[in-house]
């Protein structure tokens, strides 16, 4: 560690002295300290001497010798106070800056240790400082200001008892930064915009920091505009706005435009596309197909997308039959607003009924005109079968008709003993109706087909079993033949009620 | 060895604000003054002001009104704002540590920064 | 306009002695030292004398200063081609609380 002579921490002296400081290390030695009018340095091997033949207030001052070729980066310091009895205070700075709950030292530096009993700190003209403002004082360094808010960024003074009254340092101003946290907060509005080609239109883009130092432009297809700007000072945020009126847009005017902000802390940006159209425009379209198909007792949602500009001024879902004239109940249709010109209208149709199959149509309107989505909600039904006993032709005939949607396909099957319903190890044989006959198929009603199993010679102990399955399920019907005639059974567990 | 880098912008617009930022390596920035230093070509050097690592400065009096220094230990790094910048203010600027003696014993590079339209 | 005064351009053979004068008053040259740095072409300026005849270490023996009332001279001897730069005196100036510079002096090495 470098040895400072004379091997005193403080030295007072009188102004227009001479101050010899002598420095002696075991390698090179540097002084440093305040920069401050008047000394000389002369270096000498191991040695530095620092010197003045006319000190003055200015001097006052901790001088610090330090060994540059010291790993351990040891220092040896001797504090100069030069009492100039005009002259209480050296003042080191004209501006303090510092980050808010920084200590802000404000380097007010007594000339004369004696003085130190009756020193405080002000604002100019006298005014007393923030409440809640926590300081301490130290003759060698100043004023301390304790975790300093971005409110005590004033101007102040350090003042000294002498002889009764108090005498003012010149003063310090304290600036007091907000902790910048990264790059200014930014809002373009509106995220999208659409005109037709004459109308006015308004793109707002404004960015706000805790700290004044931060530049905001906007640019169209990567020009910057040249707006005037706002500035404004709320809510402990500084905001500038940059407003971009136009009374009549053309199509030179569309494109993107992007606001950005910046400050040290980096860039932020955001985008809006600009739309200009020739005319009001209305498009529906749906991600569903329009033809559905949906299991009775289901729900479904039908949904349509609508793009429009100028925005809607009526819209509705209808129910265009055939079965009934009931419409769709309000509370089933839900708007919800993707953004400003795309909205999804959802029309709920829980635990369907037979008589709501058909068609549903979504009617929007806007100055461009009515447009329509048109839905066609077809019903699913698993087979409903029955089985009589007739003679076509003069041949006995076992007709099943089944019902059902899609159509049902139609198995026969002959089994031995009465049962319900012919099981594996009974069955005799099956035949396998490919084609049978339609009867009926209308749109958005059941299918109903008829099959035909000529029998020469009913089998009394045997049973006729017709079996109709489609995608939803399946359904029998069995025919036992009896002395008496024939006797029909419709198995136990077809109790079907949509 | 200790080691300045200045950044920022080489271009301004005339009114607009300047704004350089010294990155010290090889040393720590703390208990030393540092300063700013401008050289207009072909001209002299004009000190610009000077911050300690408290956080407190001294500024050329001709400058005192546009000028402002911050300081930031924790990244090694000392930055200089000057306002209302005109073509007069086109120059090489320089950072710089600066010794007792009003001595300055390590610059930066330099920067030209153009002030412009 | 710089605050010290300093030639414009001074020139020398190799192997000759040059001098370069600076001139201030007494707010600055008169009561405080003076410093002197070295601008090679295209490069930051670096300290060659301070507190008016003092050279950090590296600096050749070849560079010397004086001050002399409100002036200072920095001198060159045996000149070398590699001397050719524009050499800036500078000294705290009290009125301005800080260091002011001449305007340079550019040495040619013929």
């Known amino acids: 560690i470098p040895v400072i002579e004379p091997s005193v921490p403080e030295l007072v002296v009188k102004p227009g002295a001479t101050v010899t400081l002598r420095c002696v290390g075991n390698g090179s030695v540097e002084w440093d300290g305040p920069p401050s009018p008047h000394w000389t340095l002369y270096s000498d091997g191991s040695s530095s001497i620092l010197s003045t033949n006319n000190a003055t207030f200015q001097n006052t001052g901790t001088y610090r010798c330090t060994e540059p070729g010291d790993p351990l980066g040891g220092s040896a310091a001797i504090h100069l106070y030069v009492k100039d009895p005009a002259r209480p205070w050296n003042v080191l700075a004209q501006e303090v800056v510092v980050f808010e709950d920084q200590d802000a030292l404000l380097p007010c530096l007594l000339t004369d240790p004696v003085l130190e009993a009756g020193v405080s700190l002000v604002r100019v003209r006298g005014r007393p400082l923030m409440r809640h403002t926590n300081y301490s004082f130290s003759p060698w360094h100043g004023f301390t200001i304790h975790r300093a808010k971005f409110i005590q960024s004033q101007d102040y003074q350090c003042s000294a008892l002498m002889g009764g009254r108090k005498v003012m340092s010149i003063s310090i101003r304290l600036k007091v930064q907000k902790v910048i946290p990264g790059p200014p907060a930014l809002t373009l509005v509106p995220a999208e915009l659409v005109r037709i080609r004459g109308e006015a239109a308004q793109i707002v883009c404004s960015a706000s920091s805790v700290d004044v130092n931060f530049d905001v432009f906007l640019q169209h297809n990567n020009t910057k505009l040249a707006i005037p700007q706002q500035s404004d000072f709320h809510n402990n945020r500084y905001q500038k706005v940059l407003t971009l009126n136009l009374d009549q847009v053309d199509f030179q005017h569309a494109g993107n435009y992007s606001c950005v902000a910046s400050n040290v802390q980096g860039k932020h940006s955001t985008s809006m596309f600009f739309r200009v159209v020739e005319s009001a425009y209305l498009n529906l379209s749906s991600e569903q197909n329009l033809i559905q198909e949906v299991t009775v007792g289901e729900g479904l949602n039908l949904k349509v997308m609508v793009e429009a500009y100028p925005g809607l001024q009526g819209f509705n879902w209808t129910y265009l039959g055939p079965f009934s004239d009931h419409q769709p109940e309000p509370k089933l249709a839900n708007a919800t607003t993707k953004d400003t010109y795309r909205h999804t209208f959802t029309l709920s149709l829980p635990r369907l009924k037979p008589s709501e199959a058909g068609r549903y149509s979504f009617l929007a309107r806007n100055p461009g005109g009515w447009r329509a989505l048109t839905f066609e909600l077809t019903l699913r039904y698993p087979p409903e079968v029955s089985v009589i006993w007739t003679f076509i032709n003069g041949s006995g005939t076992l007709l099943c008709a089944a019902s059902g949607y899609p159509q049902p396909n139609v198995t026969w099957l002959q089994c031995s003993g009465h049962t319900d319903r012919c099981d594996e190890a009974q069955v005799l044989q099956v035949w396998d109706d490919p084609y049978p006959e339609v009867l009926s198929q209308e749109p958005f009603h059941k299918v109903t087909v008829q099959s035909l199993l000529t029998v020469e010679t009913l089998e009394h102990n045997q049973t006729y079993e017709c079996r109709a399955h489609n995608s939803v399920g399946s359904g029998s019907w069995a025919f036992i033949p009896i002395s008496a005639g024939a006797h029909t059974h419709p198995p136990d567990e077809f109790l079907f009620t949509p | 060895q200790v080691q300045l880098q200045e950044s920022g912008p080489g271009l301004v617009k005339p009114s607009e604000t300047l704004s350089l930022t010294c990155t010290v390596s090889?040393?720590?920035?703390?208990?030393?003054?540092w300063s700013w230093i401008r050289q207009p070509a072909g001209k002299g050097l004009e000190w610009i002001g000077r911050i300690y690592t408290s956080g407190y400065t001294n500024y050329n009096p001709s400058l005192k009104s546009r000028v402002s220094m911050s300081v930031d230990t924790s990244k090694n790094q000392f930055s200089l704002k000057l306002s209302s910048v005109t073509a007069a203010d086109t120059a090489v600027y320089y950072c710089?540590?600066?010794?007792?003696?009003?001595?300055?014993?390590?610059w930066g590079q330099g920067t030209l920064v153009t002030v412009s339209s | 306009q710089s605050v010290l005064t300093q030639p414009p351009s001074a020139s020398g053979t190799p192997g000759q002695r040059v001098t370069i004068s600076c001139s201030g008053s007494?707010?600055?040259?008169?009561?405080?030292?003076v410093n002197w740095y070295q601008q090679l072409p295209g490069t930051a300026p670096k300290l060659l004398i301070y507190s008016n005849n003092q050279r950090p270490s590296g600096v050749p023996d070849r560079f010397s200063g004086s001050k002399s009332g409100t002036s200072a001279s920095l001198a060159i001897s045996g000149l070398q081609s590699e001397d050719e730069a524009d050499y800036s005196c500078?000294?705290?100036?009290?009125?301005?609380?800080?260091?002011?510079f001449g305007g340079g002096t550019k040495l040619t090495v013929l």
């Open positions: 710089a540590r600066e010794r007792l003696g009003a001595f300055f014993d390590y």
């Open positions: 090889g040393g720590s920035i703390s208990s030393y003054y």
């Open positions: 500078a000294a705290w100036d009290d009125s301005l609380n800080g260091p002011v």
């Open positions: 007494s707010s600055n040259i008169g009561s405080n030292t």
